[in-house]
Amino acid sequence: RTRSGSQLDGGLVLFSHRGTLDGGFRFRLSDGEHTSPGHFFRVTAQKQVLLSLKGSQTLTVCPGSVQPLSSQTLRASSSAGTDPQLLLYRVVRGPQLGRLFHAQQDSTGEALVNFTQAEVYAGNILYEHEMPPEPFWEAHDTLELQLSSPPARDVAATLAVAVSFEAACPQRPSHLWKNKGLWVPEGQRARITVAALDASNLLASVPSPQRSEHDVLFQVTQFPSRGQLLVSEEPLHAGQPHFLQSQLAAGQLVYAHGGGGTQQDGFHFRAHLQGPAGASVAGPQTSEAFAITVRDVNERPPQPQASVPLRLTRGSRAPISRAQLSVVDPDSAPGEIEYEVQRAPHNGFLSLVGGGLGPVTRFTQADVDSGRLAFVANGSSVAGIFQLSMSDGASPPLPMSLAVDILPSAIEVQLRAPLEVPQALGRSSLSQQQLRVVSDREEPEAAYRLIQGPQYGHLLVGGRPTSAFSQFQIDQGEVVFAFTNSSSSHDHFRVLALARGVNASAVVNVTVRALLHVWAGGPWPQGATLRLDPTVLDAGELANRTDSVPRFRLLEGPRHGRVVRVPRARTEPGGSQLVEQFTQQDLEDGRLGLEVGRPEGRAPGPAGDSLTLELWAQGVPPAVASLDFATEPYNAARPYSVALLSVPEAARTEAGKPESSTPTGEPGPMASSPEPAVAKGGFLSFLEANMFS
């Protein structure tokens, strides 16, 4: 049975497997004139591997917390018992309400793109919910994943994430948007505002159009023992134990301390959603306690001091000193100043000498001062911040932060491409293609200093020469190289890059991109002279932009042939002259020819050649450009896409008729050659290229 190349290329020829796993078919190839000897196309069939997904595919996350994906959530397997390392998930659409990251990498910048089932089993794939500014009761997120493990067919999976205040959360004991407690000076009053107690997330369970007529009712179930609660100056008591979220929001709830000591106080309450005018609604409810800390009025609160980030390399350990954590507190001993970790980064943990191997969440200033507190870096290379709260036990806790920078062991400046400056502009912005610093990750905070300036130009930021700039400025397109001297087509400069305490140098090459249109067209005939005109080389746009006549200088080539100036008319004496320089005007006047030579010392056939030119114009830097072209033995039957000024002698002789030749010096007809009728790419082309000698 016969099949055509176009059928193969169109995917219309199918192989249907039946029988043994190894086999194939024999075939011959013919172009209508020639037939190749027989060939065998081997086919090996593989047993179909099927992927399957088990697990709930739902993840319940506490608001603002990090939750690992587990095998209960996501469990893939294959019919071939594939190693979990080879079961790959690709994140097609990431989460909207948080981020997915790897415990070991903690890519704070870039989203996790793929992970394996083995990493899920290890608990290394984490979902972190980011608290929105607006309160909510329950929010839903989805992750669209694609499970793949060649040769099995991919399987799409959706992981549903439910973020809910209803869930019991060890990290967040309150079900309310805020329940932070209150600090009040002894014997004084303090307003309890929504900054300390806020149940507006219960209200968020009501659709917004109806929300204004709903409220949250708080019922005090245990009153403060050392003070009194007042709403709009009216005391709350067993007979009137209620207040509303709307009153709280209006600043009407006050705690008045009765004096006589600084013991802890507080109250217990139930809170539930209520409908308009207090009617019943099926909304959330919670029972909680609100802590009130009474502090000595004479107490001077501790003053945190400026903190220097801790810097250390990946996987190492470094002590934390007063440079990182210190406070000024004249009436507290270092042992009385307590720190509590509110939120730890993913790049390591704090540990106390003699306090076991695990992470610590509470320590004192005395631990810092004595050098007992250290940070242990894990494999992550990402900077992180500890959110701490510090208190002397009598003043309200103050938020503090400790920044930890993980230093790379080495950095590399990646230079993907030289900087190309458009010829007519004479200036161009640097980008990540020219300068980008990587260590074990990208370094977006890198800074650069010029250690060897360019010879023919300047580096500018904001229009002013500069010798220092940042990666951020590069990424924003603010760093510009501008030629100040129009005598060279290239330049270079050397920079020293600094990222997270490590440096490296690199040379950036600058080249001028010629404003030149080059059209080589199809293959050109060997032994012929073809006209070089604006259809082949055109610097007309450069001429317009610079208001000058661009000049070309031949730097190199062609290897087989030469560029010549052709006589203006048949009557003009003398043959063609060798040319090393010419102008745009010469091209437009049709005064130039390219004699295409034959490669010597080998059988006639297709070949490649090129011209390298330097293009000059007034007031702009020169540029180097090349004209690459293919050549082939002259074929009289073929229409060429350029004007031929002469054809090879042999071809004229063979034709036998003088009128069949185009006389030297007279342009031939411009024939626009169609593409050769050869199938492009595909199976047939592969066979043609490889099986016919």
């Epitope: 204004s212 007529e213 009712l217 709009s232 009216e234 009137q240 209620h242 509303l244 709307s246 009153q247 209006a250 009407q252 139930r270 539930h272 959603l273 209520q274 409908g275 308009p276 005018a277 207090g278 009617a279 019943s280 609604v281 099926a282 909304g283 959330p284 409810q285």
Partner: antibody, heavy 117, light 113 residues
Framework: QVQLVQSGAEVKRPGASMKVSCKAS????????IHWVRQAPGQGLEWMGW????????NYAQKFQGRVTMTRDTSTSTVYMELSSLRSEDTAVYYC??????????WGQGTLVTVSS | DIVMTQSPDSLTVSLGERTTINCKSS????????????LAWYQQKPGQPPKLLIY???TRESGVPDRFSGSGSGTDFTLTIDSLQPEDIATYYC?????????FGQGTRLEIK
């Protein structure tokens, strides 16, 4: 202490309108809903509707829809209830009541409205 | 609308006696989310406005004597007066505050034997 003082008794002709006022004192006026409840002679209590003095939002019992209008004046901490197209069966004592949640913790002294030709 | 039905309509009792008044709602007034029964009891004496005694079916309002107690859940509720005093002679109303329109029972009149 909390007080709700209502306007005095009125006699109205059938088809006329009446407007009873309820002035609040001793608490934050905008914090609490005001309800209107009426009681015909020798009869039980009948809820008419509520107004939220903070937002001005209202909710009326279906029976009075289209005939009743509740308004408030926050500058004088007063709530008004207007009932139009009066009939003899509208003869009743009209009470305003302050609600803490949806129960009525404080009541006005009542306003007797007599509808008679 | 939720219909509230009280029984009996009137009750003749002796002073010092224990008295119970029943109230039935046509549908449940229990909010299962917060486990509250949205039912209140009021006392009304002639020529006076009603006075709140009990809310949420069993919570006594401030200043109400502890001889008054409320019980029940869902649709069936009871007001109990432990030892009837002369000042307790009045008409008693139950009210659902579960959903609008808030509705009252027809009332139970207490008289002395």
């Amino acid at each position: 202490q909390v007080q709700l003082v209502q306007s005095g008794a009125e006699v109205k002709r059938p088809g006329a309108s009446m407007k009873v006022s309820c002035k609040a004192s001793g608490y934050t006026f905008t914090n609490y809903y005001i309800h209107w409840v009426r009681q015909a002679p020798g009869q039980g209590l009948e809820w008419m509707g509520w107004i939220n003095p903070n937002s001005g939002a209202t909710n009326y019992a279906q029976k009075f829809q289209g005939r009743v209008t509740m308004t408030r004046d926050t500058s004088t901490s007063t709530v008004y209830m207007e009932l139009s197209s009066l009939r003899s069966e509208d003869t009743a004592v009209y009470y305003c009541a302050k609600s803490w949640v949806s129960w009525f913790a404080s009541w006005g002294q009542g306003t007797l409205v007599t509808v008679s030709s | 609308d939720i219909v509230m039905t009280q029984s009996p309509d009137s009750l003749t009792v002796s002073l010092g006696e224990r008295t119970t008044i029943n109230c039935k709602s046509s549908q449940s007034v229990l909010n299962s989310k917060n486990n509250r029964n949205y039912l209140a009891w009021y006392q009304q004496k002639p020529g006076q406005p009603p006075k709140l005694l009990i809310y949420w079916a069993s919570t006594r309002e401030s200043g109400v004597p502890d001889r008054f107690s409320g019980s029940g859940s869902g649709t069936d509720f009871t007001l109990t007066i432990d030892s009837l005093q002369p000042e307790d002679i009045a008409t008693y109303y139950c009210q659902q505050h579960y959903s609008t329109p808030f509705t009252f029972g027809q009332g139970t009149r207490l008289e002395i034997k």
